[in-house]
């Protein structure tokens, strides 16, 4: 996990989230997303 401090004084937390592909479809492997401020963006 990485934490970035911006000039605005806010802290934005970036967290990598990993899901199994078979939970959402038929593919194998892992799906990696990035959560920024509580929202998964990728």
């Amino acid at each position: 996990d990485a934490e970035f401090r911006h000039d605005s004084g806010y802290e934005v937390h970036h967290q990598k989230l990993v899901f199994f592909a078979e939970d959402v479809g038929s593919n194998k492997g892992a799906i990696i997303g990035l959560m920024v401020g509580g929202v998964v963006i990728a």
């Epitope: 989230l17 990993v18 592909a21 078979e22 194998k28």
Partner: nanobody, 124 residues
């Protein structure tokens, strides 16, 4: 509900191997993604590895990739963690846990059920 009991921990020399087991009770074992976490004294619980419901997909924490292998036997309701090339920094209590499918497998909050853990000590 799922109860989890780990076994297989112990004292091993650096470079050695151990195989941990996690036996589950309850009829719903096969609907859970399963994971291993570890906690060293004074440190936060750390994600080690996870395996999907079918066993066809796995994912590993960076610190154990290439050394540890997770597997499962749904008929026996058991999850395994084969640990090779052990290092002193692998010393910790290892916990098995069950996660709801569709939730992130690398975060503690996804896991509803936890075992008490088994101690692994890597020392010469």
């Amino acid at each position: 509900e799922v109860q989890l009991v780990e076994s297989g921990g112990g004292l091993v020399q650096p470079g050695g191997s151990l195989r941990l087991s996690c036996a589950a009770s309850g009829r719903t074992f096969s609907i859970y993604n399963m994971g291993w976490f570890r906690q060293a004294p004074g440190k936060e619980r750390e994600f080690v590895a996870a395996i999907s419901r079918s066993g066809s997909s796995t994912y590993y924490g960076d610190s154990v990739k290439g050394r540890f292998t997770i597997s499962r036997d749904n008929a026996k309701k058991t999850v395994y963690l084969q640990m090779n090339s052990l290092k002193p920094e692998d010393t910790a209590v290892y916990h098995c846990a069950a996660a709801r499918f569709g939730t992130p497998i690398n975060t503690r909050g996804s896991y509803d059920y936890w075992g008490q853990g088994t101690q692994v000590t890597v020392s010469s």
